[in-house]
């Protein structure tokens, strides 16, 4: 990679004392001759993050490789991208800086993100000062994504970018709707073109295992090391204030790199110098924390102390980064104390060694408790270690105990003893439990009581119909939860088997016991609709109905009818037991009442999906019956009917109805209105001669009343063959009485 | 190209459900909020709900609060509206609209669906 | 809620003439209004975006202006093509609102 830093200057009181400074370790870099290739560039680049118009920045340079931007005259010259370009040739490398505003409402929690392709990327943009608006997110000042203000997350906003690919690549910004540009959270992704470890134009070249930080270049394979390491591996620390490629640059000032921001080019990105860290880079690493943003952790051994600039500082005779090799003596590497493998797997055990001599492949072996020495299959050596790979035959209960690896050299010896615990799958005990079941689906309660070793990491459920010689289908279920077994056949017996699984390889454990499990009958999908209605009384209604044509048979055993009450909040259900019924009569009704009425289909214990409403409205009950009617003959086609007004009326009586049949016919009643409720007395005109009549009446006021009792009359004569009664005035009458 | 194509509309009695479906191409349907809209006949543009592109906020007109659901399906790249307890007034074409702001912050309605019909009657 | 009143609801134009609709908001709705055109049968059409802001394809006979809570549409000469319903929509805040709509008719 070309040897370039952009190092920015964030003490930021006073922007005016801010300074970009850009250099270059390349040999000649920036002299501008066409002998040693173009000059160094910087300058800020307004393509995405525009800020207003200012003083023109002044560009200084110093000697042949540096280059020094000033002039900032207030804080919002500062926000944006800057970039240096350096290099020749196919080697002209850009390295960008992000500059956020520290008084912005969003801030990032990481300005510089370097993932792997194929990797998911998270921006978290922190909330310095809210608003209650849309917060926008853009990738290279091109709109992306949109989170509404209430999407934030214990004080941050997240962009999840799952699954990135080198053309990610790029500025984004978080932005509140209606706050200016400025206030933005800004961000660099950078994706490099392949896999963890990986570098080539097919990604097919392994990567030499960047130490301190260190990025692996996709393209070269080279590490690009944090500021202030050195080395093909950056396994060099430089010494502290120090930096470039071969620690050859110093950090100006008389407090080092505190306050510095140090970018390199891509993959690397930009982070603070060695042993500093913080949002402005001036906060000293904690102890135990060394390196570019403090992200190491020294864990020294053997007496070695932390250095926040190189990390573990050896005692004499003490080597390694945590001063944990002998400078003689070979030692067991990093061996846990526990390891942990399933009955009957064959694991692979490694064991890596170090010291001088350094140890090769015949001179690492394994124990086992009962004595028995593995020797190695493969060994893999590397600088600083080799690692010797054992494959176990089959496990069996007696392996468990303490095993030891041990290493011998001319140098002498070392061995560590390690506990092996060979665990048993876990084998169910009882059958599944249903908990639930409709027709396509059964709710079952996998966890049971099992022989063998926990934890349970994985439950899988097995189900097939009952008798079928077809494939089991298999769910694998989260260990504390139930689980629905969906898409079955209904009416349908399933066998259901259990098994479960302990972490690690082959710890999957046998099938429990099967258990039969029986899914409902199919619940009714036809949606009723009514067709009518009608009231046949104040407390009986007609109901008609009628369902969707569909072919094959009715999945149905009847329907079901309710009447919802809203005022006095009372359901009344009425049970058709005919699926082929249409209609039906309820009575019993409440006169005067608002009812919703609606219809479903039911098949055994499931209803079908209920027909819209209708609303229904039965007519008051009405009045008591007319008192003491009496009839009598006047002629042979007319006969003269008395009464009394009916007792304890709830209102004045609009009309009477008088019913009038033939004794013995098997014709309608005929009714006749008396549209004059004030009156005692009428005459029924138009009869037959010599013919008993049946007369009865009710009088209305909102709705029809009870019924009179029933008079019996004969009309007088034998006269002609009337048209038919008709009721007469009660003028007319009173000019017949007088 | 970009395409919005709304479905599911149709004939539906009083108090009963439909589901309406906007299919998406020709954008990141995934990174953009999605506006119901709808017009009764004769009448003028009603905003009836917005989701936000995680599917994890979203807000509705007054008129539809408690009956309508919006969802999506950012996998599928379809919007979705879920209409129960249906009335009469629901009566409408119901468009779909891609919401956006664009580097400026400026909002706009850019891409609209053809619409819908969905009849609410007895 | 903010509340959108637009005016007329309907007018009557030649071709050539000069015509300005107005949209009110019940309260400050900054600059966060667009305007639509609809033509009968189809879906509507964006014209102006943050009040004054021309979209992409639309002719330079359109403009907007205003901001806090009054707002205007004008079309500076009226085209055979422009007689339609145009419709004002705040975006400040939801629920998001449009106007009544104004119909613009041939005289």
């Known amino acids: 990679a070309v040897d370039l830093t952009l190092l920015a200057n964030l003490r930021l009181t006073d922007p005016q004392r801010f300074f970009l400074t850009c250099v270059s370790g390349e040999a000649g870099a920036g002299r501008g001759s066409d002998a040693w290739g173009p000059p160094l560039l910087l300058e800020k680049d307004d393509r995405i993050v525009r800020t207003p118009p200012g003083p023109p920045l002044r560009l200084a340079r110093n000697g042949s490789h540096q280059v020094t931007l000033r002039g900032f005259s207030k804080p919002s010259d500062l926000v944006g991208v800057f970039s240096c370009v350096g290099g020749a040739g196919a080697r002209r490398t850009r390295v960008i800086y992000v500059h956020n505003s520290p008084g912005a409402h969003l801030l990032p929690d990481k300005v510089t993100h370097t993932v792997n392709k194929g990797d998911t990327a998270v921006l978290s943009a922190r909330v310095h000062k809210e608003k209650q608006t849309d917060v926008i997110w853009k990738s290279n000042g091109s709109y992306f994504y949109t989170l509404d203000w209430h999407e934030a997350q214990d004080g941050r906003f997240l962009l999840q970018l799952p699954n990135v690919q080198p053309p990610s690549s790029g500025i984004y910004s978080a932005t509140y709707l209606e706050a200016s540009p400025l206030g933005s959270a800004f961000f660099r992704l950078i994706v490099r073109g392949c896999g963890a470890g990986r570098w080539g134009p097919g990604c097919t070249k392994e990567c030499p295992g960047c130490l301190h930080g260190g990025v692996c270049h996709d393209h070269d394979g080279e590490c690009v090391c944090p500021p202030g390491f050195t080395g093909t591996r950056c396994e060099q620390a430089c010494r502290e204030g120090r930096f470039g490629q071969s620690c050859q640059e110093q950090c100006p000032g008389i407090s080092g790199c505190r306050g510095l921001t140090f970018c390199l080019p891509d993959p690397y990105g930009c982070s603070c110098g060695s042993g500093w860290r913080g949002s402005q880079c001036q906060e000293a690493c904690a102890p135990g924390h060394f390196g570019a943003d403090c992200r190491l952790q020294c864990q020294c051994q053997n007496g070695g102390t932390c250095d926040r600039f190189s990390g573990c500082v050896c005692p004499s005779g003490w080597h390694g980064v945590h001063c944990e090799k002998s400078d003689r003596i070979p030692q067991i590497l990093n061996m846990a104390s526990e390891l942990e493998f399933n009955l009957e797997t064959m694991p692979r055990i490694n064991c890596a060694a170090a010291g001088n001599p350094f140890p090769v492949r015949g001179s690492i072996e394994l124990r086992k408790p009962d004595g028995t020495v593995l020797l190695s299959t493969k060994a893999i050596v590397e600088p600083e270690k080799t690692t010797a790979e054992f494959e176990v035959p089959r496990l069996v209960l007696a392996d468990s105990g303490f095993w030891e690896c041990r290493v011998s050299t001319s140098g002498g010896q070392d061995s560590r003893r390690f506990k092996v615990n060979v665990k048993v799958p876990p084998v169910p005990l009882a059958a599944p439990r249903l908990l639930t079941k409709q027709s396509r689906q059964l709710v079952v309660s996998p966890l049971v009581s099992f022989s063998g070793d926990g934890p349970i990491s994985t439950v899988r459920l097995h189900y097939r119909p009952q008798d079928s010689t077809m494939d089991w289908s298999t769910i694998v279920v989260d260990p504390s939860e139930n689980v629905t077994l969906m898409n079955l056949r209904p009416k349908t017996g399933y066998s259901v088997r259990v098994q479960l699984s302990r972490p690690g390889e082959g710890g999957e454990g046998a099938w429990g016991p099967p258990t039969l499990m029986t899914t409902d009958c199919p619940e009714p999908l036809l949606q009723p609709w009514l067709e009518g209605w009608h009231v046949e009384g104040t407390d009986r209604l007609r109901v008609s109905w009628s369902l969707p044509l569909v072919p094959g048979p009715l999945v149905g055993d009847g329907f079901l009818l309710r009447l919802w009450d809203g005022t006095r909040g009372q359901e009344r259900r009425e049970n058709v037991s005919s699926p082929q019924a249409r209609t039906a009569l309820l009575t019993g009704l409440t006169p005067g009442t608002h009812y919703q009425l609606d219809v479903q289909l039911y098949h055994c214990t499931l209803l079908g999906p209920a027909s819209p409403p209708a609303h229904v409205l039965l007519p008051p009950s009405g009045p008591p019956a007319p008192r003491h009617l009496h009839a009598q003959a006047l002629s042979d086609s007319e006969i003269q009917l008395t009464w009394k007004h009916p007792e304890a009326l709830p209102g004045p009586i609009s009309k009477y109805v008088v019913e009038v049949q033939v004794a013995g016919g098997a014709g309608d009643p005929l009714w006749i209105d008396v549209d004059r409720p004030e009156e005692t007395s009428t005459i029924i005109r138009g009869l037959n001669a010599s013919t008993r009549y049946l007369f009865r009446m009710r009088a209305s006021i909102q709705g029809l009343g009870d019924w009179s009792n029933t008079v019996e009359e004969s009309t007088l004569g034998n006269g002609l063959q009337a048209e038919g009664p008709v009721q007469e005035s009660r003028a007319a009458e009173e000019g017949l009485d007088q | 190209e970009v395409q919005l194509l709304e479905s599911g509309g149709g004939l539906v009695q009083p108090g009963g459900s439909l589901r309406l479906s906007c299919a998406a191409s020709g954008f990141t349907f995934s990174n953009y909020k999605m506006n119901w809209v709808r017009q009764a006949p004769g009448k003028g543009l009603e905003w009836v709900s917005v989701i936000y592109p995680s599917g994890g906020w979203t807000y509705y007109a007054d008129s539809v609060k408690g009956r309508f659901t919006i969802s999506r399906d950012n996998s599928k790249n379809t919007l979705y509206l879920q209409m129960n307890s249906l009335r009469a007034e629901d009566t409408a074409v119901y468009y779909c609209a891609s919401g956006y702001y664009d580097s400026s912050g400026y909002s706009r309605f850019d891409y609209w669906g053809q619409g819908t019909l969905v009849t609410v009657s007895s | 809620d903010i509340q959108m009143t637009q005016s007329p609801s309907s007018l009557s134009a030649s071709v050539g003439d000069r015509v300005t609709i107005t949209c009110q908001a019940s309260?400050?709705?900054?600059?966060?209004l667009n305007w639509y055109q609809q033509k009968p049968g189809k879906a509507p059409k964006l014209l102006i975006y943050?009040?004054?802001n021309l979209e992409t394809g639309v002719p330079s006979r359109f403009s907007g202006s205003g901001s806090g809570t009054d707002f205007t549409l004008t079309i500076s000469s009226l085209q055979p093509e422009d007689f339609a319903t145009y419709y004002c929509?705040?975006?400040?805040?939801?629920?998001?609102?449009f106007g009544q709509g104004t119909k613009v008719e041939v005289k």
């Open positions: 943050h009040a004054s």
């Open positions: 929509l705040q975006y400040k805040s939801y629920p998001r609102l």
């Open positions: 309260q400050d709705i900054s600059n966060y």
